[in-house]
């Protein structure tokens, strides 16, 4: 049997899980008592074509309902397990009240209000994210959809649509919630060193500390076997055997264009004359290959105060 759920004091409309031609009559029964459900609209629970309407729903309406489609050749019976829940007291929507998750990835994305097509609703549909009304211009409600412009991971969360069902001159509230997750389309690329520039010379003062950042970008999304590191005279810093010169482990960063980048900082506690003759290589590598930018150190010229 299929399952449907609703909230106490809201409208709930369900469709017979067995499908037949729209012209065939559908009868609904309380499964446990076999009692027929009437079609008269004055009842709180009544049948309308293949739909069963709870206007409004109550917790005690929970149970199994049977629908029978009477066609000339055979009768088809479907069963529907209906559960009516009390409204959650807090903003945390329990899993059992959640419709299917929507996965977004494009720059613009839409979330459809679940089950809305079963109701006689009128625009606008109100949208809430984690219980807060959405008022930013990035969020646009159109018909039964919520459009989100320039989707980011911050847009992930639980989205609730609220609309009004009109029946017999009475309006009933309906709410439905679903999760939205953002799947960023990732790619890996040949590393690009953003700092230091190619064949760069950096000015330093003898006896003073110096630090040089090696930064590179590798694409978008999680990166496997990606690294940035320093070499001194083609030797990794750890093996160079100079305690004054240390490498600070790579930090994850994002660049302005949303690329995933890593940075490693080379720190020299007190620059010596010998350091000026060394070659410093900033290396970036991943499964696509390796790139290096070599830099040299030059003594800073004293400012002439004449």
């Amino acid at each position: 049997s299929k399952s449907s759920w609703g909230l106490e004091n809201e409208a709930l409309i369900v469709r017979c899980p067995q499908r037949g031609r729209s012209t065939y009559p559908v009868e609904w029964y309380y499964s446990d008592t076999n009692e027929s459900i009437p079609t008269q609209k004055r009842n709180r629970i009544f049948v309308s074509r293949d739909r069963l309407k709870f206007l409004p729903a109550r917790v005690e309406d929970s149970g199994i309902y049977a629908c029978v489609i009477r066609s000339p050749n055979l009768n088809k019976t479907g069963y529907l397990n209906v559960t009516i829940h009390k409204k959650p007291p807090s903003c945390n929507i329990p899993d059992y009240l959640m419709y299917s998750t929507v996965r977004g990835s494009d720059k613009n994305f839409k979330i459809t209000c679940p089950t809305i097509d079963l109701y006689n609703w009128t625009a606008p549909v109100q949208w809430f994210k984690n219980c807060k009304a959405l008022q930013e211009p990035r969020f646009r409600a159109h018909r039964s959809y919520l459009f989100i412009d320039n989707v980011t991971h911050d847009d992930e969360g639980d989205y609730t649509c609220q609309f009004t069902h009109a029946e017999n001159g009475t309006n009933y509230i309906v709410t439905a919630t679903r999760s939205f997750t953002v799947e960023e389309k990732g790619f890996s690329m040949f590393p690009v060193i953003t700092n230091p520039p190619y064949n760069h010379t950096m000015e330093v003062e003898i006896g003073k500390p110096a630090s040089i950042a090696c930064s590179a970008c590798f694409g978008k999304g999680s990166h496997f076997l990606a690294d940035v590191l320093w070499q001194i005279n083609k030797t990794v810093v750890g093996n160079f055997g100079e305690a004054r010169i240390q490498e600070e482990e790579g930090r994850n960063e994002s660049s302005s264009n949303d690329m995933d980048c890593l940075t490693s900082v080379l720190r020299i506690t007190g620059v010596t004359e010998k350091d000026l003759s060394l070659e410093y290589d900033c290396l970036a590598l991943n499964l696509h290959g390796m790139i290096r930018h070599t830099i040299r150190l030059r003594r800073k010229q004293p400012i002439d105060h004449r």
Epitope: F190, G221, L225, L285, L287, H288, G289
Partner: antibody, heavy 125, light 107 residues
Framework: QVQLVQSGAEVKKPGSSVKVSCKAS????????IIWVRQAPGQGLEWMGG????????DYTQTFQGRVTITADESTSTAYMELSSLRSEDTAVYYC??????????????????WGQGTLVTVSS | DIQMTQSPSSLSASVGDRVTITCRAS??????LNWYQQKPGKAPKLLIY???SLQSGVPSRFSGSGSGTDFTLTISSLQPEDFATYYC?????????FGQGTKVEIK
């Protein structure tokens, strides 16, 4: 010619560890990354992790993070994959493979161009 | 991770048949697609890289095509030694993921 030769089959108890070796020959070991892939009986290929020997940079896919350690010994041109806390579902053939990109001229396409013969690891109590 | 879906999961064919295997990526992967052949008890062998480039030593009856999300491996005239399992693999984004495999069996 390029060859990757793996260590022999292993039978292990649940909870123990296994270390599989992969000896490379016929090319400059440090210039290429080595990855490890496993294949459970009758199943597809699952990437575990890899290493870039020249820098010792190793990385692991999420499924194996914390349970696998990949190392390389430049002096013997050998890569190792150690998998700990073994369970019965780790019974599989473990392959090492070379990534086709040469780190020193950044030539080549992106693929696993040479593979070891595979090492069957059976986890059973 | 990028999902790779191969179809069919298995097929029966006769020697001399033209065989086509398709691979679909869950997002566009340009032409970063490889095909491997694996025989029972053996390691996979690279057949095609970059969607359509034949690896050296691979017979010319194997060809690959496609870009974006849809790719095809074609064996123009199936030979007895071609009965094996074929895997596609994307190299657009790490980890480089494989399809679930297509087993080519003798009819």
């Amino acid at each position: 010619q390029v060859q990757l030769v793996q260590s022999g089959a292993e039978v292990k108890k649940p909870g123990s560890s296994v270390k599989v070796s992969c000896k490379a020959s016929g090319y400059t070991f440090t210039n290429y990354a080595i990855i490890w892939v496993r294949q459970a009986p009758g199943q597809g290929l699952e990437w575990m992790g890899g290493i870039i020997p020249v820098f010792g940079t190793a990385d692991y896919t999420q499924t194996f993070q914390g349970r696998v350690t990949i190392t390389a010994d430049e002096s013997t041109s050998t890569a190792y994959m150690e998998l700990s806390s073994l369970r019965s579902e780790d019974t599989a053939v473990y392959y090492c493979a070379r990534v086709s990109t040469n780190y020193y001229d950044s030539s080549g396409y992106y693929a696993f161009d040479y593979w070891g013969q595979g090492t069957l690891v059976t986890v059973s109590s | 991770d990028i999902q790779m879906t191969q179809s069919p999961s298995s097929l029966s064919a006769s020697v001399g048949d033209r065989v086509t295997i398709t691979c679909r990526a869950s997002q566009s992967i340009s032409s970063y697609l490889n095909w491997y052949q694996q025989k029972p008890g053996k390691a996979p062998k690279l057949l095609i890289y970059d969607a359509s480039s034949l690896q050296s030593g691979v017979p010319s009856r194997f060809s690959g095509s496609g870009s974006g999300t849809d790719f095809t491996l074609t064996i123009s005239s199936l030979q007895p030694e071609d009965f094996a399992t074929y895997y596609c693999q994307q190299t657009y984004h790490t980890p480089w993921t494989f399809g679930q495999g297509t087993k080519v069996e003798i009819k």
